[in-house]
């Protein structure tokens, strides 16, 4: 025998109090799959959360965070404070990155500057709290007498003007 509740579509529930009739989900509730015996309560985006997507009869509300915060956890279950670039969030608030580290985002941790010498390269642009160093050519490429980084222009034959 087929379960009569299996015919109830998403957005409804199988109402045992009414001979297993498919009843619409009440306000502020939803069912995202068919055959449900209850509807789930919609998530409410309160306080530091704001509504990204309203609840419907077939899908839950989705929240994100108010400006100055960013989402953490599955389905944005938490909002964490933003910091400025060049800082990281510690257990005592936002702190500047230590010398030799950087953070180019408003979230996450300070990361060490790239060590150019590990790749046999030189530092082209120094790092800051907000930006990583930029590695350039290897020191050998910059030493006197080394071949030029750009190839020389081709020689023109005498007596010929450029086209």
């Amino acid at each position: 025998l087929q379960d009569p509740c299996s015919n109830c579509p998403a957005g409804t529930f199988c109402d045992n109090n009414r001979n297993q009739i498919c009843s619409p989900c009440p306000p502020n509730s939803f069912s995202s799959a068919g055959g449900q015996r209850t509807c789930d309560i919609c998530r409410q985006c309160k306080g530091v959360f704001r509504t990204r997507k309203e609840c419907s009869s077939t899908s839950n509300a989705e929240c994100d965070c108010t400006p100055g915060f960013h989402c953490l956890g599955a389905g944005c279950s938490m909002c964490e404070q933003d910091c400025k670039q060049g800082q990281e969030l510690t257990k005592k608030g936002c702190k500047d990155c230590c010398f030799g580290t950087f953070n180019d985002q408003k979230r996450g941790i300070c990361r060490p500057w790239t060590n150019c010498s590990l790749d046999g390269k030189s530092v082209l642009v120094n790092g800051t709290k907000e930006r990583d160093v930029v590695c350039g050519p290897s020191p050998a490429d910059l030493s006197p007498g080394a071949s030029s980084v750009t190839p020389p222009a081709p020689a023109r034959e005498p007596g010929h003007s450029p086209q």
């Epitope: 964490e80 990281e88 969030l89 510690t90 257990k91 005592k92 702190k95 941790i109 300070c110």
Partner: nanobody, 124 residues
Framework: EVQLLESGGGLVQPGGSLRLSCAAS????????MSWFRQPPETGLKWVSS????????YYADSVKGRFTISRDNSKNTLYLQMNSLRAEDTAVYYC?????????????????WGQGTTVTVSS
């Protein structure tokens, strides 16, 4: 799969006590520092307390020092937060978290796994 499951939240009167638990699975529990965080209704996530892998070192936010006690039972893979002298401002969703490194007062939030949270409401 690494999982954290909190329990023990509920409604309590000001001055009352609650004990939160966090059951861990999927990793070698004793190898990692663990933390409690909370998110009050109107503000962002705040660190509450941390404990190192052995349970020897504990750290607390100033707002809970002397009232909350973090502990762990490595034989049961469980983290605890004993909360005494509760105040209205302790109302929040409480999350346990696995830290990627040793947690100290001003270390960054080096958290790689969060629980789903348990709600604590302090009201008369």
């Amino acid at each position: 799969e690494v999982q954290l499951l909190e329990s023990g939240g509920g409604l309590v009167q000001p001055g009352g006590s609650l004990r939160l638990s966090c059951a861990a699975s999927g990793f070698t529990f004793s190898n990692y520092a663990m933390s409690w965080f909370r998110q009050p209704p109107e503000t962002g996530l705040k660190w509450v307390s941390s404990i190192d892998g052995s349970g020897g070192d504990t750290y607390y936010a100033d707002s809970v020092k002397g009232r909350f006690t973090i502990s762990r039972d490595n034989s049961k893979n469980t983290l605890y937060l004993q909360m005494n002298s509760l105040r209205a401002e302790d109302t929040a969703v409480y999350y346990c978290a696995k830290e990627g490194s040793h947690g100290t007062d001003d270390s960054h939030y080096d958290v790689d796994v969060w629980g789903q949270g348990t709600t604590v409401t302090v009201s008369s």
